[in-house]
């Protein structure tokens, strides 16, 4: 029962992570610049994302512009785009794998296979979490590096945008959720009585012994 609870929690976390990742990738708030004159009033705010950039004037008026040419974009931006999309697709694949092996589905009947699918989905979610983390950390590193580099003029200095924080949250949720799914079946799903064994047992349930419980010295 605890295992089922962990599975549900794991999937809920990964779903939240996926939604966070989607929002993070879509929002044009990876890099933020607040252009401030000598007064404390912000003249304008520029948001830059993976797909577009937006300018918010002090009047509140906002204008967004989708990046024109794919080839004209910096390579790190192209890589971030690709990794973001791949991470989301990998997480979706992980969800499909999980659904195939979930306790409440009948896609796969055999309990061992179900456990293996859940474990696989957990690993896939962890991979998705890592893939989400790469562009977010890379972008954050570039922003921080440029911010403290005296050779970068003020017009080129940026700050960490909300999308990066969402990306970190997404990655954390995917890693945590995937980790929980991996933990629900530590020994390939053989920790409990087999579905068939339980049906024919008499007084004591037959517990299958793990390979490590047999003496191995006779099998050199």
């Amino acid at each position: 029962m605890a295992s089922a609870g962990m599975q549900i929690l794991g999937v809920v976390l990964t779903l939240l992570g996926w939604v966070n990742g989607l929002v993070s990738c879509a929002l044009p708030m990876w890099k933020v610049t607040a252009f401030i004159g000598n007064s404390i009033v912000v003249a304008q705010v520029v948001w830059e994302g993976l797909w577009m950039s937006c300018v918010v004037q002090s009047t509140g008026q906002m204008q967004c512009k989708v990046y024109d040419s794919l080839l004209a974009l910096p390579q790190d931006l192209q890589a971030a785009r690709a990794l973001c999309v791949i991470a989301l697709l990998v997480a979706l694949f992980g969800l499909l794998v999980y659904l195939a092996g979930a306790k409440c589905t009948t896609c796969v009947e055999e309990k061992d296979s179900k456990a293996r699918l859940v474990l696989t989905s957990g690993i896939v979610f962890v991979i998705s979490g890592v893939l989400t983390l790469i562009p977010v950390c890379w972008t954050a590193h570039a922003i921080i590096r440029d911010f403290y580099n005296p050779l970068v003029a003020e017009a080129q200095k940026r700050e960490l945008g909300a999308s990066l924080y969402l990306g970190w949250a997404a990655s954390g949720l995917l890693l945590l959720g995937g980790g929980l799914l991996c933990c629900t079946c530590p020994s390939g799903g053989s920790q409990g009585p087999s579905h068939y064994m339980a049906r024919y047992s008499t007084s004591a349930p037959a517990i299958s012994r793990g390979p490590s419980e047999y003496p191995t010295k006779n099998y050199v």
Epitope: I36, N38, N149, L151, A153, E154
Partner: antibody, heavy 120, light 107 residues
């Protein structure tokens, strides 16, 4: 007192190269970036490029890429600028300047200037 | 590149005059502007940074103002030692660019 001491005037032939120096004193050499600025006779000022004495990282004005090379020697607190393939257009006074700490592309201290004359 | 335009290349002035030198940027430079004074045969000297902040040792008769694209250097009462060429420079974006200079000449 902050001082930027530049090397003396140079008379060079067309096509030749020249390397001018800028020795600093009165502050920690690696704390501020170093700029080089060109002033042709009776004309305005043109930024050539900048170097971070900490790590030798450079940025150049597109116009001077391939013409100027900036280097530093931390041990002697000296910045250098080499100009190559000189033509009469390169005859000018060249200044080394120190970037303002909080606004590095502003220039708070200037060397006395090095006059380069390109003539055959 | 950002273009810096100083509308007057030279000014005929008298001692004691209030002098105003203007500088216009081709785009908003968010007050990242410096003013320099250069006397013949000398290197430029920084007077004002951040459009309005007077550097240490600069006489209080100098002041800077402006925002956005338009900036002004003012000298309240011109002294003999103020006769020089004045340059504005933006340091908002690279490459940093200078105005063409405004030369003050005594009438």
């Amino acid at each position: 007192e902050v001082q930027l001491q530049q090397s003396g005037p140079e008379l060079v032939k067309p096509g030749a190269s020249v390397k001018i120096s800028c020795k600093t004193s009165g502050y920690t050499f690696t704390e501020n970036i170093r700029h080089w600025v060109k002033q042709s006779r009776g004309k305005s000022l043109e930024w050539i490029g900048t170097i971070n004495p900490n790590n030798g990282e450079t940025r150049y004005n597109q116009k001077f890429k391939g013409k100027a090379t900036l280097t530093v020697d931390k041990s002697s607190s000296t910045a250098y600028m080499e100009l190559r393939s000189l033509t009469s257009e390169d005859s000018a006074v060249y200044y080394c300047t120190r970037g303002i700490t909080k606004s590095p592309y502003g220039m708070d201290y200037w060397g006395q200037g090095t006059s380069i004359t390109v003539s055959s | 590149d950002i273009q810096m335009t100083q509308s007057s290349s030279s000014f005929s002035v008298s001692l004691g005059d209030r002098v105003t030198i203007t500088c216009k940027a081709s785009e908003d430079i968010y007050n990242r502007l410096a003013w320099y004074q250069q006397k013949p045969g000398n290197a430029p000297r920084l007077l004002i940074s951040g459009a309005t902040s007077l550097e240490a040792g600069v006489p209080s008769g100098f002041s800077g103002s402006g925002s956005g694209k338009d900036y002004t250097l003012s000298i309240t009462s011109l002294q003999t030692e103020d006769v020089a060429t004045y340059y504005c420079q933006q340091y908002w974006s690279t490459p940093p660019t200078f105005g063409g200079g405004t030369k003050l000449e005594l009438k």
